[in-house]
């Protein structure tokens, strides 16, 4: 921003009424008037170029310094060419001297040269030659000097002529301020420019109404340079929640809009499934039945829990059940759907029911499922099972109702035994099996059925209470089809797979090998 100039003295604007002191009186500098465009133009002039030893002084009135630290002095003047005068006028000069003196009081007409300190010799860039002077084409020069730091209540300027032909048309004394500024939503007060060229005055800014320094951000600061220019902005303010930047101010969000945090972003329209917000809203309330999860951004539409899983099937396979379902028809507007499976078992005889999580095994943890199927095993035979699949999303915890579907299944058979060949010879096969421990108490006996492969007319059956059997009197080098089935009080359980086991050939007789 451009520096602001505060004028302390303006000769040209004073219309000749300042009454500056001249020394010696009347013989050196004197006030003159000219009319230009029907307006009087005043100037102090001196032109005693033909007389040697000139020492003519013009002193301003006392100027109150006020808050100025460094003053700037702008001079507008003409200087006539010494060659305009006969023989170049040996005593003629083309410069004059600028002085200043500080004081705490106005000395009035008591003029003492010794109190003055020279600022500079003022030389023109362009001198006015005879032909220009006579044609009224005078060359106006503009020179600027500065002085500081000033410390007393006021000061005088003085102009010393030592034999030049000078007309002083304008003397303007001013100091500079960095103007009041709004930047980055911070207000910086009008600040007096410092007096030392290298230094920059650090000025703290104040956030405008409804603006704040963002968390972890730097407080707004700027630097006021000697020339009244603001430099090096640091930090900024942001419009607080519920307000947005409009030009250099923070304006409340319009009804139906919101802003949830201090940021540079504008207010956003209230998302779907929210109520119309009032002016200056930081968020938009959800419609009835819709919710916002704690981690949901305020810009996200309000959502609701999902409906129940759409379609649930339970397919029993012996002592296993495969549960399959399809996603809810209404996701509630969310994508974070998970499923929970719970199990209840009922004894048909007593009708008594209870949870069965401890006794069954799931193919994957039954809570927080993202897939739409799970296998439940280790089910007890002749038991009724009810499976519940609940669909949940990020806002399900905000309501008391649940969205679930149930499926029931009756387990009528034990799980098929798992059969393995323990050993063999030319005439025997040793076979063992296993079933899940929870089902073992229900098994009365195991029935082993075997026959030669390719012979569908005859088969042999052996029953045992144990978990193994040796089948004897078999033909060597012959493949047998073997199946094991559990027998329960209620009837036959599920049969195992039919296994093919081969006896050894005679060459390997005497060896019992697996």
């Amino acid at each position: 921003a451009q520096g602001k100039e505060v004028v302390l003295l303006d000769f040209a604007a004073a219309g000749g009424e300042l009454g500056w002191l001249t020394h010696p009186y009347g013989k050196g500098w004197d006030l003159m008037q000219n009319i230009m465009n029907d307006m009087p133009i005043y100037m102090y002039s001196v032109c005693n170029v033909m007389s040697g030893d000139q020492d003519n002084w013009l002193r301003t009135n006392w100027v109150y310094r006020g808050e100025a630290e460094r003053i700037f002095i702008e001079l507008k003047f003409t200087v006539r060419d010494c060659n305009s005068f006969p023989g170049g006028a040996s005593s003629c000069k083309e410069t004059f001297n600028l002085y200043y003196a500080e004081s705490d009081l106005d000395y009035g007409t008591n003029f003492q040269k010794r109190l003055f300190t020279k600022i500079d010799t003022i030389a023109p860039d362009e001198i006015t030659v005879s032909s220009d002077f006579e044609a009224r084409h005078v060359k106006l020069n503009v020179e600027e000097r500065s002085v500081g730091p000033l410390t007393r209540k006021g000061f005088y300027l003085a102009f010393q002529d030592i034999g030049a032909c000078v007309a002083l048309l304008s003397v303007r004394v001013y100091y500079k301020k960095c103007p009041e500024l709004l930047q980055g939503l911070a207000h910086f007060p009008e600040t007096i420019a410092g007096s030392d060229a290298p230094s920059l005055a650090t000025v703290a800014g104040t956030c405008v109404d409804h603006a704040v320094v963002p968390p972890g951000g730097e407080e707004p600061r700027m630097h006021c340079a000697v020339d009244g220019e603001w430099l090096v902005p640091i930090g900024q303010c942001l419009c607080q929640a519920g307000y947005e930047k409009v030009e250099d101010a923070c304006q409340a969000c319009s009804p139906g809009f919101f802003k949830f945090e201090a940021s540079e972003s504008p207010c956003l329209e209230c998302p779907e499934h929210t109520l119309p917000s009032p002016e200056g809203a930081t968020s938009c309330e959800c419609e009835e039945g819709f919710f916002r999860a704690p981690q949901d951004p305020a810009s996200m539409p309000c959502t609701r829990p999902p409906s129940a899983p759409h379609y649930l099937t339970a397919v029993g396979m012996g002592a296993k059940v495969e549960l399959r379902w399809t996603p809810p028809q209404d996701s509630g507007g969310r994508e974070d759907i998970v499923y929970s499976v719970t199990c209840e078992q009922c004894w048909p005889e007593s009708g008594e029911c209870g949870p069965c999580e401890a006794s069954v095994r799931y193919s994957e943890p039954p809570h927080g499922l993202t897939r739409t199927s799970v296998t439940v095993s280790d089910l007890e035979p002749h038991m009724n099972y009810t499976f519940t699949v609940e669909a949940r999303n990020g806002v399900s915890g905000l309501v008391t109702s649940r969205s679930f579907r149930t499926a029931s299944v009756s387990i009528n058979q034990t799980e098929p035994p798992k059969v393995r060949l323990e050993g063999r010879s030319t005439t025997s096969l040793s076979v063992s099996w296993s079933i899940p421990p929870p089902q073992q108490s229900r098994v009365w006996k195991y029935e082993v059925t075997y026959r030669k492969k390719g012979d569908s007319n005859s088969y042999n059956v052996r029953r045992t209470e144990g978990f193994s059997v040796t089948l004897d009197d078999l033909a060597p080098d012959t493949t047998y089809l073997v199946q094991v089935q559990a027998l329960t009080q209620e009837g036959q359980g599920a049969g195992s797979k039919v296994h093919e086991f081969q006896t050894l050939s005679p060459e390997g007789s005497g060896n019992l090998a697996v």
């Epitope: 009454g19 009347g26 004197d30 008037q33 000219n34 009319i35 170029v49 033909m50 007409t109 032909c165």
Partner: antibody, heavy 120, light 109 residues
């Protein structure tokens, strides 16, 4: 209206004294330097003396230096010329005049003139 | 020298243009002022500075300067312009504060 009204002239013997007055009206007297200019009978104008607006500075023509004293009373809006040791060559019509700007004029307002005759 | 020199007399026919000159070293440094004086009256300011006329002065009066010379020109002289005319300038020599020319008697024939 703006005017200067003079008084105090007359006949005086050589070596005598006389005081001329010039009463100002219609302008801010204390803001202007004031001059006396004289004109001997049948002759041209001759500048005599000046006093600054506040009375702190005066300047005289060599011909009257040491004999004449210019003064002013800004509270009475009046300019004075005290003439001592008068000589026959001081015989003239004396005019008071206002310097419109600065110390040296131009002289934009003149009194009506008052005749001083130095004769035995 | 600190003198300003004017011709003692100049005449002009009514309606004609007449120029009165003023010579002096001071005029190199400072502009002349011109005064008109009619018999038995105080002088009256006609021209000052570059070529400035106080209000009430007819525009047939004008001033100019060049080098050590200043001129007062009356364009279309009238009978009432018959008077004595004096030039005046600051003194650049330091001898005097201000100097008058000897005056020029203008006769309108």
């Amino acid at each position: 209206q703006v005017q200067l009204v003079q008084s105090g002239g007359g006949l005086v013997q050589p070596g005598g004294s006389l005081r001329l007055s010039c009463a100002a009206s219609g302008f801010t007297f204390s803001s202007y330097a004031m001059h006396w200019v004289r004109q001997a009978p049948g002759k041209g104008l001759e500048w005599v003396t000046v006093i600054s607006h506040d009375g702190t500075n005066t300047y005289y023509a060599d011909s009257v230096k040491g004999r004449f004293t210019i003064s002013r009373d800004n509270s009475k809006n009046t300019l004075y010329l005290q003439m001592n040791s008068l000589r026959a060559e001081d015989t003239a019509v004396y005019y008071c005049a206002r310097a419109s700007v600065g110390a040296t004029g131009p002289f934009d307002i003149w009194g009506q003139g008052t005749l001083v005759t130095v004769s035995s | 020298s600190s003198e300003l020199t004017q011709p003692p007399s100049v005449s002009v026919a009514p309606g004609q243009t007449v120029t009165i000159t003023c010579q002096g070293d001071s005029l190199r440094s400072y502009y002349a002022s011109w005064y008109q004086q009619k018999p038995g009256t105080a002088p009256k300011l006609l021209i000052y500075g570059e070529n400035n006329r106080p209000s009430g002065v007819p525009d047939r009066f004008s001033g100019s300067s060049s080098g050590t010379s200043a001129s007062l020109t009356i364009t279309g002289a009238q009978a009432e312009d018959e008077a004595d005319y004096y030039c005046n300038s600051r003194d650049s020599s330091g001898t005097h504060l201000t100097v008058f020319g000897g005056g020029t008697k203008l006769t309108v024939l």
